[in-house]
Interface confidence: medium
Amino acid sequence: DAEFRHDSGYEVHHQKLVFFAEDVGSNKGAIIGLMVGGVVIA
C-alpha cells in the first residue's frame, strides 16, 4: 500500500514508485500522475 501524508510536507511512506509523469502541472484536481517534490504521490 502507498500511504500519503500530503499534509506533512508530502512525506511518502511505503511508497511504490509505480509510474512517473512528465507533466508536472499544478492542477490540484488531477493529482494522480503528477509529481510533488520529486516523488509520485498517487
Epitope: D1, A2, E3, F4, R5, H6, D7, F19, A21, E22, D23, G25, N27, K28, G29, A30, I31, I32, G33, L34, A42
Partner: antibody
C-alpha cells in the same frame, strides 16, 4: 453545473469486451482526476482506478490489472473504461466519479448515473 | 489494502431520532482522507461529508462527522424520512482507495 453523463446499459457475452464512456461538462476536464467505481447489485463500492485527464496517467487497483483500461479523449472531455475478458463476476453497475478540486484528499464530489453491464450467454 | 468495516450493517430509526454510524479501518487513516457518501435506492452515490467533518455542498446541517486514527463516525442529529439510504465511508489515504461495507438506514 458539473455533469457526468455515462453511456447506456450493456448486455455482453462471456469473453467479450465492453467500453463505457463518461462525457463531462460544466468544468475544465483536465483539472480533475476521474475515478471509476464498481458496484455489484446490493453490495458495496469498489474503486477500480483513477486517471489524470491532463496526461493520461492512471493508477489502478491491482485487482483490476488486466481487466480495466482507463483512457480519456480531451477533445470531447470524455473518459472511457474498457473491460475485457468479461465473466459473470463483471456484471455490475460501473460509475465514473470526479475527484473534488482539492484532489489531495481524493473525495469524489460528482458521480455519473452509472452504466449497467450484464454478462450473459 | 485498508479494509473499512461499518456498523451497524442495517438499522431502522424513527423520525427525529439521533443516528450514529461508525467506520473502522484496518489501519490508521489520516483524518483528511476519510469521506462519507449517501446512496439512495436507484441513484448514484453522493458526497455527503469530506475530510472527516466537512459538509458537502447542499447537505443539511443535521449531518455531521468526526473521528481520527482508525475510528470514524457519521451522525444524523434528527432522522428524517428523506435520509433513508445506504451510507458508505471511503478512504483516500492509501491505494487502493477503499469504501466501507455500507450501512443501510431505514425508517420505522
Amino acid at each position: 453545473e458539473v455533469q457526468l453523463q455515462q453511456s447506456g446499459p450493456e448486455l455482453v457475452k462471456p469473453g467479450a469486451s465492453v467500453k463505457i464512456s463518461c462525457k463531462t461538462s460544466g468544468y475544465t476536464f483536465t483539472e480533475n482526476t476521474m475515478h471509476w467505481v464498481k458496484q455489484i447489485h446490493g453490495k458495496s463500492l469498489e474503486w477500480i482506478g483513477g486517471i489524470n485527464p491532463n496526461n493520461g496517467v492512471t493508477n489502478n487497483n491491482q485487482k483490476f490489472e488486466g481487466k480495466a483500461t482507463l483512457t480519456v479523449d480531451k477533445s470531447s472531455s470524455t473518459a472511457y473504461m474498457e473491460l475485457r475478458s468479461l465473466t459473470s463476476e463483471d456484471s455490475a453497475v460501473y460509475y465514473c466519479a470526479r475527484s473534488d478540486y482539492d484532489a489531495l484528499y481524493y473525495s469524489m464530489d460528482c458521480w455519473g448515473q452509472g452504466t449497467s453491464v450484464t454478462v450473459s450467454s | 489494502e485498508i479494509v473499512l468495516t461499518q456498523s451497524p450493517t442495517t438499522m431502522a430509526a424513527s423520525p427525529g431520532e439521533k443516528i450514529t454510524i461508525t467506520c473502522s479501518g484496518s489501519s490508521s487513516i489520516i483524518s483528511n482522507y476519510l469521506h462519507w457518501y449517501q446512496q439512495k435506492p436507484g441513484f448514484s452515490p453522493k458526497l455527503l461529508i469530506y475530510r472527516t467533518s466537512n459538509l458537502a455542498s447542499g447537505v443539511p446541517t443535521r449531518f455531521s462527522g468526526s473521528g481520527s486514527g482508525t475510528s470514524y463516525s457519521l451522525t444524523i442529529g434528527t432522522m428524517e424520512a428523506e435520509d433513508v439510504a445506504t451510507y458508505y465511508c471511503q478512504q483516500g489515504s492509501s491505494i487502493p482507495f477503499t469504501f466501507g461495507s455500507g450501512t443501510k438506514l431505514e425508517i420505522k
